[in-house]
Interface confidence: low
């Protein structure tokens, strides 16, 4: 277990031309806050994939009002670090996304409005317990300067903050100085590597190389039994010389920590190490509540049904995710009918309709034939947003006003000759061909070569020929 810490140093215009305008104005004061999302490994994951290592929101920065037209300076930042606790081992390689959000504090209906100013991402290698690493990332005309590190939470140590566990030796609780290994409450932390020869049954250590004795045992390796009359310490592990303790109720007995918190004894009382999302003396309070404004993009925050349950964000149309942080590609659902062009404007969806169609989703087919007549006995056909005339034989053109030459398209195949006729056209076929358009060759035995039947069909099933 441990904590990834991110310190934002500055957010402002990057070097070079095209400095961005200030995101705040006298009419619309605003303040910044940041969101960090961590994922294990060096994966090229999409921004919407889950923050498997964890995520955190910063506090809101100071309210900032820019004079109209002034260039954007480095903007005032929130206090403190962004901290992402991790329960398991630190992976060593990770991907990050850092988002800069603007909270507009004008008189919006329904409270502040949030908008994403910049998003930077990267992939890094980092050992836990190392020094702060500094970084500069650019997003468009903005530049973000920050430092980050991963540190282990005691008693975890090492570059991965790994914790070794072993089955409990006693049913009720772990040995002195050893915490339960949450969430495996039936296991205890393995002690660190103790002094060589330190009794595995009667000794333990809190620092590498030491050997401290459990109750009733003494000696440099905790191999010598002692009588309880020599105990000096009223409770807890004693020094290696006296080596015993008088059992008594401990402050962690019965685990006073709620919501999966793990308890450790302190000189005066106890301390709860709380899982992500909870804090307070006994981990009794959810760490993020609706008061912290966790729902982005105008999402409505609703507290859980009981004091220990988490908040829920009800997202407005176009957004999803536990914090309404993900924009839905609503156009991917192809909501515009009849070939309309979909435009996702963020606050709304628009369809740009093709000619002949109308309505929010281009669902209405305009009556193309209304008021239009097709000449010479032609009939009007609607479709595709424009009217079309199906003309009577011998006529053509948009409105069937042109006398058609039926032979103009050279409809007779294989050198057949075309003759215009009052009922249409007639093809006089060249030798060896037959059919209305001279399309079939005549075999020497007089049989015509009809199209082949598709696999699985009987040749004598002509209505199903393709």
């Amino acid at each position: 277990a441990g904590v990834f810490e991110l310190q934002i140093h500055s957010f402002g215009p990057g070097p070079g031309p095209g400095a961005p305008r200030s995101p705040c104005s006298a009419r619309l004061p605003c303040r910044l806050f940041f969101r960090v999302c961590l994922k294990p490994g060096l994966s090229e994951e999409a921004a919407e994939s889950p923050c498997a290592l964890g995520a955190a929101l910063s506090a809101r920065g100071p309210v900032y009002t820019e004079q109209p037209g002034a260039p954007a300076p480095d903007l005032p930042l929130p206090d403190g670090l962004l901290q992402v606790p991790f329960r398991d081992a630190w992976p060593g390689t990770f991907s990050f996304i850092i988002e800069t959000w603007r909270e507009e504090l004008g008189d919006q209906i329904g409270g502040p409005a949030w908008s994403l100013l910049a998003r930077v991402a990267g992939r890094r290698r980092l050992a836990a317990g190392g020094p702060w690493a500094r970084d500069i990332q650019r997003a468009g005309a903005w530049e973000l300067r920050f430092s980050y590190r991963a540190r282990c939470e005691p008693p975890a140590v090492g570059t991965a903050c790994t914790r070794l566990c072993r089955p409990r030796s006693a049913p009720s609780r772990c040995g002195p100085g050893l915490r339960p290994c949450a969430p495996l409450e039936d296991e205890c932390e393995a002690p660190l590597v103790c002094r060589a020869g330190c009794s595995p049954e009667h000794g333990f250590c809190e620092q590498p190389g030491e050997c401290r004795c459990l109750e009733g045992w003494t000696g440099p390796l905790c191999t010598v039994p002692v009588s309880t009359s020599s105990c000096l310490s009223p409770r807890g592990p004693s020094s290696a010389t006296t080596g015993c303790l008088v059992p008594g109720p401990g402050p962690c007995d019965g685990n006073p920590c709620a919501n999966g918190g793990s308890c450790s004894e302190t000189p005066r009382s106890f301390e709860c190490t709380c899982p992500r999302g909870f804090y307070g003396l006994r981990c009794e309070v959810s760490g993020v509540t609706c008061a912290d404004g966790p729902c982005f993009n105008g999402g409505l925050c609703v507290g859980g049904a009981d004091p220990d349950s988490a908040y829920i964000c009800h997202c407005p149309p176009g957004f999803q995710g536990s914090n309404c942080e993900k924009r839905v590609d609503r156009c991917s659902l192809q909501p515009c009918r009849n070939g309309g062009l979909c435009l996702d404007l963020g606050h709304a969806l628009r369809c740009r309709c093709r000619a002949g169609f109308a309505g929010p989703r281009c669902e209405h087919d305009l009556d193309d034939c209304a008021g239009r007549a097709c000449a010479n006995g032609g009939t009007c056909v609607e479709g595709g947003g424009a009217h079309r005339c199906s003309c009577a034989l011998g006529f053509g053109g948009r409105d069937c006003r042109e006398r058609a030459d039926p032979c103009a398209a050279r409809p007779c195949a294989h050198g057949g000759r075309c003759y215009a006729h009052f009922s249409g056209l007639v093809c006089a076929c060249a030798p060896g061909y037959m059919g209305a358009r001279c399309e079939f060759p005549v075999h020497p035995d007089g049989a015509s070569a009809l199209p082949a039947a598709p696999p699985g069909l009987r040749p004598g099933d002509p209505q199903r020929y393709l």
Partner: antibody, heavy 120, light 112 residues
Framework: EVQLVESGGGLVKPGGSLKLSCAAS????????MSWVRQTPEKRLEWVAA????????YYPDTVKDRFTISRDNAKNTLYLQMSSLRSEDTALYYC?????????????WGQGTSVTVSS | DIVMSQSPSSLAVSVGEKVTMSCKSS????????????LAWYQQKPGQSPKLLIY???TRESGVPDRFTGSGSGTDFTLTISSVKAEDLAVYYC????????FGAGTKLELK
């Protein structure tokens, strides 16, 4: 400018009830947790009740639990404290206060207070 | 509940003097997951409501003069006024917001 104006205080007999109101202006009321804090005649400050931004969670110390109820109307930008079974030790100046964000933040703005006297 | 103890209860000072006052909590106010101390300092002048000076034990509220400094961690905290001015005469309260909310009894700053 952030303003918090309390009202509803007065003289009440032991066992009686009183409802305090706090009208908020100058900020987005629905974004902040709020508390009631009282100041005794001996000038001690005692926290009385807190409520999160959407009114979904209330917090009380044991001294007032089951007697006091905090609520809010975000549409009216108003915080309330319903006090019942009042005792003489509830006599105090009652302030409403805004937390800097959620409940687990310090209180950055306070009203001028409304006086409650419980006496027979 | 966490008990907050302030000392001294009153302090007589001269203008320009440096002043320190102490606040102790009955248990640690340091939350390990974010390394923040859940402690605030307030100033209350006669006839006025309390005013936030310091939060997270050492972060100065905007508009608060830099002669006010909060320090400490865990259970022991200090408010220092580097050079007292006449307008600083007031009662100073510490408050924890680690679990529920409790205040100290206050330290009254008076003129000698």
């Amino acid at each position: 400018e952030v303003q918090l104006v309390e009202s509803g205080g007065g003289l009440v007999k032991p066992g009686g009830s009183l409802k305090l109101s706090c009208a908020a202006s100058g900020f987005t009321f629905s974004s902040y947790a709020m508390s009631w804090v009282r100041q005794t005649p001996e000038k001690r400050l005692e926290w009385v009740a807190a409520i999160n931004s959407n009114g979904g969670r209330n917090y009380y110390p044991d001294t007032v639990k089951d007697r006091f109820t905090i609520s809010r109307d975000n549409a009216k930008n108003t915080l309330y404290l319903q006090m019942s079974s009042l005792r003489s030790e509830d006599t105090a100046l009652y302030y409403c206060a805004r937390h800097r964000g959620g409940y687990y933040y310090a209180m950055d703005y306070w009203g001028q207070g409304t006086s409650v006297t419980v006496s027979s | 509940d966490i008990v907050m103890s302030q000392s001294p209860s009153s302090l007589a000072v001269s203008v320009g003097e440096k002043v320190t006052m102490s606040c102790k909590s009955s248990q640690s106010l340091l939350y390990s997951s974010n390394q923040k101390n859940y402690l605030a300092w307030y100033q209350q002048k006669p006839g006025q409501s309390p005013k936030l000076l310091i939060y997270w034990a050492s972060t100065r509220e905007s508009g608060v003069p830099d002669r006010f400094t909060g320090s400490g961690s865990g259970t022991d905290f200090t408010l220092t006024i580097s050079s007292v001015k006449a307008e600083d005469l007031a009662v100073y309260y510490c408050q924890q917001y680690y679990t529920y909310l409790t205040f100290g009894a206050g330290t009254k700053l008076e003129l000698k």
